[in-house]
Interface confidence: low
């Protein structure tokens, strides 16, 4: 028996369902009574789900996994993972045994989009050209860690005096706070771009300083 999985990682959004595809080519006359199927975490060797003795033995992993019972006889050994969490990320191995045995691993990449950044300014009044200001760009609840870019009004990257911190919450999602310290010109627009490297999703925030008032 030959087991096939997708070579590319499966990307799943947090709290959605993901399908880890695995297939084999059944011989003519194949019946489910012959099939032994195991899904296992590749790294920790933990059992995730199994099918044997002609029946689904059920989930051994958070009760959030399921097979596609009607498709098994056609050689579809895919695993459905429900309500994906950050901790589900990793490699899963699909083992299939009929008379002989084969296995293959598929990677699950978990992702969550970052929120539109909120911008804060310190100080936020009595600003004069030549003042040093601190602009903070905050974006929340994303995964994996973000890439943060700052640009001025002309699109020129600002790389000096930038400090970015990312903290994971109890669900493993990241809140990102990036601080730009800059000397004000007469007028200025400062843009922050928070990029999710897996989703290739960009979240933009900007602040324009034109004397008074401020525009966010």
């Amino acid at each position: 028996v030959e087991v096939q999985v997708s070579e590319d990682p499966v990307v799943a959004l947090v709290d959605t369902d993901a399908t880890l595809r695995c297939s084999f080519s059944p011989e003519p006359g194949f019946s489910l009574a012959q099939l032994n199927l195991i899904w296992q975490l590749t790294d920790t060797k933990q059992l995730v789900h199994s099918f044997t003795e002609g029946r689904d033995q059920g989930s051994a992993y958070s009760n959030r996994t399921a097979l596609f019972p009607d498709l098994l006889v056609q050689g579809n050994a895919s695993l459905r993972l429900q309500r994906v969490r950050v901790t589900d990320e990793g490699s899963y191995t699909c083992f299939v045994s009929i008379q002989d045995f084969d296995s293959a691993a598929v990677s699950l990449q978990v992702a969550a989009p970052y929120s539109k950044p909120s911008m804060t300014l310190e100080p936020n009044k009595d600003l004069r050209p030549g003042n040093m200001v601190t602009i903070t760009c905050s974006s929340y609840q994303g995964y994996p860690e973000a890439e943060v870019f700052w640009k001025d009004g002309q699109g020129v990257p600002l790389t000096g005096n930038v400090t970015t911190s990312q903290m994971a919450n109890e669900r493993g999602l990241f809140d990102v706070h990036s601080v730009l310290r800059v000397v004000l010109g007469a007028n200025g627009t400062y843009s922050c771009l928070v990029r999710n490297p897996v989703l290739q999703q960009d979240a933009h925030g900007s602040v324009t300083i034109t004397g008074q008032p401020l525009t966010f």
Epitope: N36, I38, Q40, T44, K45, Q46, L47, S50, T52, E53, Q57, A60, F95, S97, F101
Partner: antibody, heavy 121, light 107 residues
Framework: QVQLVESGAEVKKPGSSVKVSCKAS????????ISWVRQAPGQGLEWMGR????????NYAQKFQGRVTITADKSTSTAYMELSSLRSEDTAVYYC??????????????WGQGTLITVSS | DIQMTQSPSTLSASVGDRVTITCRAS??????LAWYQQKPGKAPKLLIY???SLQSGVPSRFSGSGSGTEFTLTISSLQPDDFASYYC?????????FGGGTKVEIK
């Protein structure tokens, strides 16, 4: 709590075969691997091979390939290890072991009591 | 096959001593290493898995460390019940292999 109970000690002649049984209770027998590990008197531990009953397949250490056969009967939750062409250096305590409900096929939380096989003419 | 080399083969120590046993793999095994304790006439008992994870029910005086090819088992304060033989086992690849063992005896 998984329990593994092995068959009793045996004395065998060189060139003969021996079959040791290991009955499991208290766990999901078919889902987890049963390994066989032996220990010659005063020596260290030596992994011989394993069977994953749920898959119905066995893997063997190269050293024992062709001489050892590991099987499992899911209906009785019993694993068997048969070693053929016995020689004096096969005198050892033979253990069955598994990972229990930790789902590990590779480390051993639970062990049988051991079966002493003596090969002597 | 991956060779596992333990040292020392015998170690004499007293109750209360801090004891360290070393295990070396012939090639990198990441952290796929377990430690077992065995008393005469008894089956081995799993102490540590994945190099440093303490098996449930094992006293906290036992700890494991290391990754790659170099690993240690430490008993922070040796107790009378700890005089036994100790084995490391790699499970990075088949065949699973054990170290030759370290006997911890009373000084």
């Amino acid at each position: 709590q998984v329990q593994l109970v092995e068959s009793g000690a045996e004395v065998k002649k060189p060139g003969s075969s021996v079959k040791v049984s290991c009955k499991a209770s208290g766990g999901t027998f078919s889902s987890y691997a049963i390994s066989w590990v032996r220990q010659a008197p005063g020596q260290g531990l030596e992994w011989m091979g394993r069977i994953i009953p749920i898959l119905g397949i066995a893997n063997y250490a190269q050293k024992f390939q062709g001489r050892v056969t590991i099987t499992a009967d899911k209906s009785t939750s019993t694993a068997y290890m048969e070693l053929s062409s016995l020689r004096s250096e096969d005198t050892a305590v033979y253990y069955c072991a598994n990972g229990g409900d930790s789902s590990s096929w590779y480390t051993f939380d639970y062990w049988g009591q051991g079966t002493l096989i003596t090969v002597s003419s | 096959d991956i060779q596992m080399t333990q040292s020392p083969s015998t170690l004499s120590a007293s109750v209360g001593d801090r004891v360290t046993i070393t295990c070396r793999a012939s090639q990198s095994i990441d952290n796929w290493l377990a430690w077992y304790q065995q008393k005469p006439g008894k089956a081995p008992k799993l102490l540590i898995y994945k190099a440093s994870s303490l098996q449930s029910g094992v006293p906290s005086r036992f700890s494991g460390s290391g990754s790659g090819t170099e690993f240690t088992l430490t008993i922070s304060s040796l107790q009378p019940d700890d005089f036994a033989s100790y084995y490391c086992q790699q499970y990075d690849s088949n065949p699973l292999t054990f170290g030759g063992g370290t006997k911890v005896e009373i000084k």
